[in-house]
Interface confidence: low
């Protein structure tokens, strides 16, 4: 029988025993920073090389007895989960272990830093294929540990870490809070967040995704053929490290940004019961459970996007929150959200040569979040077009006027404390769908991108009666790049993307005024890239999809009709 | 403890001459900051990671560490450089009294200092 966790990470329609090849992950080296390990365990012998690196604090307590099997317990189990012959995710991955945790499972930030430095030096001395570093540990928020992780990630290393077992916001812990690290929370066989005693898995915006982390069968250091069940976010992180090794083995050239986007894309969506999380964390916590991709061939033809939430701005009147994309990603849209509804919108602005998404709090507001939609769009050239407040009854509008640029997102920002409910017309002039429309007192920002084969369309879902949530989703084959609300009136709490769905939240219906005021429209911008699809087809030498272009052409929406008259 | 006392004697002798000509003022610009773990039981006072500015070379890191030892020795404090970082972050790990933090923050090239803290298997 296949352990539940290996079954769970196997894509639907596949059997885990057939799907997981014995050489999966063979081109990848996984570094494990943990306790000592029992390297001659049958699950991992010959697969794990114990380095001579050791940096651990003394064990606490005078009555502590160092027992080899206890000292090795945590690390041995995790090595087995990553690459074990029998119960491992990436059975072909080779591993290297560094001892940074003592026999009580305790280490130091400094010891971990020196371990990361050791890995970097090893990489420089003897460059190998893709590297994955598994950090199944957590401490309090550490600027220096996060900085070291950032540097290692920028050197091309994929870092995977445990979100932490404190039933708390993962952003309060390191390395879980490092944006460059892939942070993993734990779920159980019922896809519920894992409870560990009185605590449980961490959650929040610093978690990238969840993975199996309860009752995970793996190598036990009690004997060379023993198995044991362990639970925790370390086990969850080990699954993702294994999945990452499998993906990198299939596509060794994947960047960290591409790998993260794929992990998110292939995850099971919306299966976690969010009621387990504190109410204020539910919207911030990704509802994703990691899974292997359904094919070892790349998925390079897809336009991948993910949602990145900022930290909370705090309640001061002029407070702002900033959400950033990873260096290799494009910011295609920006939105904002406030639980109190008091906000002054959001704008895309340049910072250090890159676009960021900034949300603005309003007087009396409890604070805002900025929400960035971050996408992988090779050879993209994106810019922001801004229209100042129109001061006219028609409302403010802005479009992408450069030839070949398409609209990927709309943002609006206002200086007035309360926009009131003066509604601009929701309907756009026909033939000009590539425009952002907003309140007349707001400045409007259009994200306009040029990329080979990129095409986008606007989808709207309007509800005349007040409703707490309005959603609109992009159809199969299209990716949500932009999510905003029309109109930007005061009862709209904000808009954000959840996977391929644009969600617009409004104040509790009981607090809103008349039904006419309650009308809300969710506006999604859905894009796809013909260029990526064609490149992928050429790469796979496939002719079976020859009809794709005709379908694309038939469905294509031409944004620039008014330009064509001039040629 | 005996070893450390031995180190101390050695440091005072080896570094005092070097210390005299060194200015204590930091480079122009922002003042270095101090960080420590928000979770008190996880703090490890007495050991500090001194992080230097991004483009600092290894030789400068070593020189800054020696400077700290010399200045501390002059004030009668024992310090021990446990590790000099290079490859990921420039800086060094030092065992010293918290009394020396103010002095360490004023050293040239220092970006920030973080008190060491515990991490745990999850």
């Amino acid at each position: 029988s296949i352990p539940w966790n290996l079954e769970r990470i196997t894509p639907p329609r596949y059997r885990a025993d057939e799907y997981q090849p014995p050489d999966g992950g063979s081109l990848v080296e996984v570094y494990l920073l943990d306790t000592s390990i029992q390297s001659d365990h049958r699950e991992i012998e010959g697969r794990v090389m114990v380095t001579d690196f050791e940096n651990v604090p003394e064990e606490d307590g005078t009555r502590f007895h160092r027992q080899a099997s206890k000292c090795d317990s945590h690390g041995t189990h995790l090595a087995g989960v990553v690459s074990g012959r029998d119960a491992g995710v990436a059975k072909g991955a080779s591993m290297r272990s560094l001892r940074v945790l003592n026999c009580q499972g305790k280490g130091t930030v400094s010891g971990t830093l020196i371990g990361l430095e050791f890995i970097r030096k090893s990489q420089l001395v003897q460059p190998v294929g893709p590297l994955v570093v598994l950090l199944p540990l957590a401490g309090g928020y550490s600027r220096v540990l996060n900085a070291a992780c950032q540097r290692l990630a920028r050197a091309g290393v994929v870092l995977v870490t445990a979100a932490g077992n404190f039933r708390d916001d993962a952003c309060l812990y390191s390395p879980a809070s490092a944006p460059e690290v892939i942070t993993v929370g734990a779920t159980n066989a019922q896809d519920q967040p894992v409870t560990l005693g009185t605590l449980g898995t961490n959650f929040g915006r610093c978690v990238d995704l969840f993975a199996p982390g309860e009752d995970i069968i793996g190598a036990s250091s009690d004997c060379s053929t023993c198995f044991v069940s362990q639970s925790g976010t370390s086990q969850a992180a080990a699954h993702v490290a294994g999945i990452a090794a499998m993906m990198l083995s299939a596509e060794p050239e994947l960047t960290l940004a591409e790998l993260r986007q794929r992990l998110i894309h292939f995850s099971a969506k919306d299966v976690i019961n969010e009621a387990w999380f504190p109410e204020d964390q539910r919207v911030l916590t990704p509802n994703l459970v990691a899974a292997l991709p359904p094919s070892t061939h790349g998925a390079g033809w897809q336009l991948f996007c993910r949602t990145v939430w900022s930290a909370h701005s705090g309640p001061t009147r002029m407070a702002t929150a900033v959400a950033r994309c990873a260096p290799d990603e494009e910011l295609l849209s920006c939105s904002s959200f406030s639980r109190s509804g008091k906000r002054r919108g959001e704008r895309m602005e340049a910072q250090g040569g890159k676009l960021v998404c900034r949300a603005h709090n309003a007087f009396g507001g409890e604070g805002v979040y900025a929400i960035a939609r971050c996408c992988l769009l090779p050879q993209a050239n994106c810019s922001v077009h801004t229209a100042p407040p129109a001061e006219a009854s028609m409302g403010t509008r802005v479009h992408c006027h450069q030839q070949g640029h398409v609209l990927t997102g709309c943002s609006s920002h206002w200086e007035v404390e309360d926009l009131g409910t003066h509604k601009p017309p929701v309907l756009r002039p026909r033939g000009q769908p590539n425009q952002c429309v907003g309140h007349r007192e707001a400045s409007i920002h259009a994200s306009c991108c040029h990329a080979p084969g990129l095409e986008c369309k606007v989808k709207e879902h309007g509800i005349p009666a007040p409703q707490e949530q309005v959603t609109v989703a992009c159809e199969e084959g299209w990716t949500l790049t932009g999510c905003s609300a029309l109109p930007g009136t005061s009862h709209v709490l904000g808009a954000y993307a959840v996977d391929n769905t644009c969600v617009v939240r409004s104040r509790d219906v009981s607090t809103t005024g008349s039904t006419s005021e309650g009308a809300v429209t969710a506006v999604a911008i859905c894009c796809r890239s013909r260029h990526l699809a064609q490149a992928s087809q050429e790469l796979q030498g496939s002719t079976s999809g020859s009809g794709l272009n005709d379908i694309f052409e038939a469905q294509k929406i031409e944004w620039h009709e008014h330009h064509h008259h001039h040629h | 403890q005996e070893d450390e006392d031995g180190d101390y004697e050695e440091l005072v002798l080896a570094l005092r001459s070097e210390e005299d000509g060194l200015a204590e003022a930091p480079e122009h610009g922002t003042t270095a900051t101090f960080h420590r773990c928000a979770k008190d039981p996880w703090r490890l006072p007495g050991t500090y990671v001194v992080v230097l500015k991004e483009e600092t070379h290894l030789s400068q890191s070593e020189r800054t560490a020696r400077r700290l030892q010399a200045q501390a020795a002059r004030r009668g404090y024992l310090t021990k450089i446990l590790h000099v970082f290079h490859g990921l972050l420039p800086g060094f790990l030092v065992k010293m009294s918290g009394d020396l933090l103010e002095l360490a923050l004023k050293l040239p090239h220092v970006d920030y200092i973080e008190e060491d803290s515990s991490v745990f298997a999850q």
């Epitope: 049958r42 012998e45 010959g46 697969r47 012959r85 029998d86 119960a87 069968i217 053929t225 069940s229 | -």
Partner: antibody, heavy 121, light 112 residues
């Protein structure tokens, strides 16, 4: 068919070393771990250790740890067991036996014919 | 180390007899994940190499006659020969592979 063919009998003096070979045929050498088991005259079977031919990883029984070396040459599908500092107690038949490298197949399904090593002054 | 104790150390029987050999281990050989007992039985004839009969305590190796059967779990195991044949007179060994490998001291089965 699957076969493990061992080298011929050896007579050694105390303090000397002996190296026994085991040539595999009829299967993929690196897919199976190679174990060594010995049997003193009129006695039972005693496990000495194993080598994983694919990785070269070895594991020795505590009793032999300091004296035994197991190696392999994958190019000729041969495993070797060398025992040093021989005493008369090492007089025995030495067997190689294969074990499939998978999940929980920890049994020896094919054995060599055995090599008699006699230690005598 | 796990200690394997076989009994009896020798026994005499006739062709057609039903014979039972027992093997006790000093600790459980049941693997919690696979629910398999890591115990095997081998037969050895004088001057010959051992031959695998039973693995996982009760699974017969291919080509082994069905008069040989294995049973037991945890620490107590049995090898049964339902109807002795002339070629079955040999020495039988149990072997644990739960933690490294240990053989029992052997049971010599002789013609009465």
């Amino acid at each position: 068919q699957v076969q493990l063919v061992q080298s011929g009998a050896e007579v050694k003096k105390p303090g000397a070393s002996v190296k026994v070979s085991c040539k595999a045929s009829g299967y993929t050498f690196t897919d199976y771990w190679m174990h060594w088991v010995r049997q003193a005259p009129g006695q039972g079977l005693e496990w000495m250790g194993y080598i994983n031919p694919s990785s070269g990883f070895t594991k020795y029984h505590q009793n032999f740890k300091d004296r035994v070396t197991m190696t392999r040459d994958t190019s000729i599908s041969t495993a070797y067991m060398e025992l040093s500092r021989l005493t008369s107690d090492d007089t025995a038949v030495y067997y190689c036996a294969r074990q499939y490298d998978y999940d929980e197949d920890w049994y020896f399904d094919v054995w060599g014919q055995g090599t008699t090593v006699t230690v005598s002054s | 180390d796990i200690v394997m104790s076989q009994s009896p150390s020798s026994l005499s029987a006739s062709v057609g007899d039903r014979v039972t050999i027992t093997c006790k281990s000093s600790q459980s050989l049941l693997n919690s994940r696979t629910r398999k007992n890591f115990l095997a039985w081998y037969q050895q004839k004088p001057g010959k190499s051992p031959k695998l009969l039973i693995y996982w305590a009760s699974t017969r190796e291919s080509g082994v006659p069905d008069r040989f059967s294995g049973s037991g779990s945890g620490t107590d195991f049995t090898l049964t020969i339902s109807s002795l044949q002339p070629e079955d007179f040999a020495t039988y060994y149990c072997k644990q592979s739960f933690n490294l490998f240990t053989f029992g001291q052997g049971t010599k089965l002789e013609i009465k």
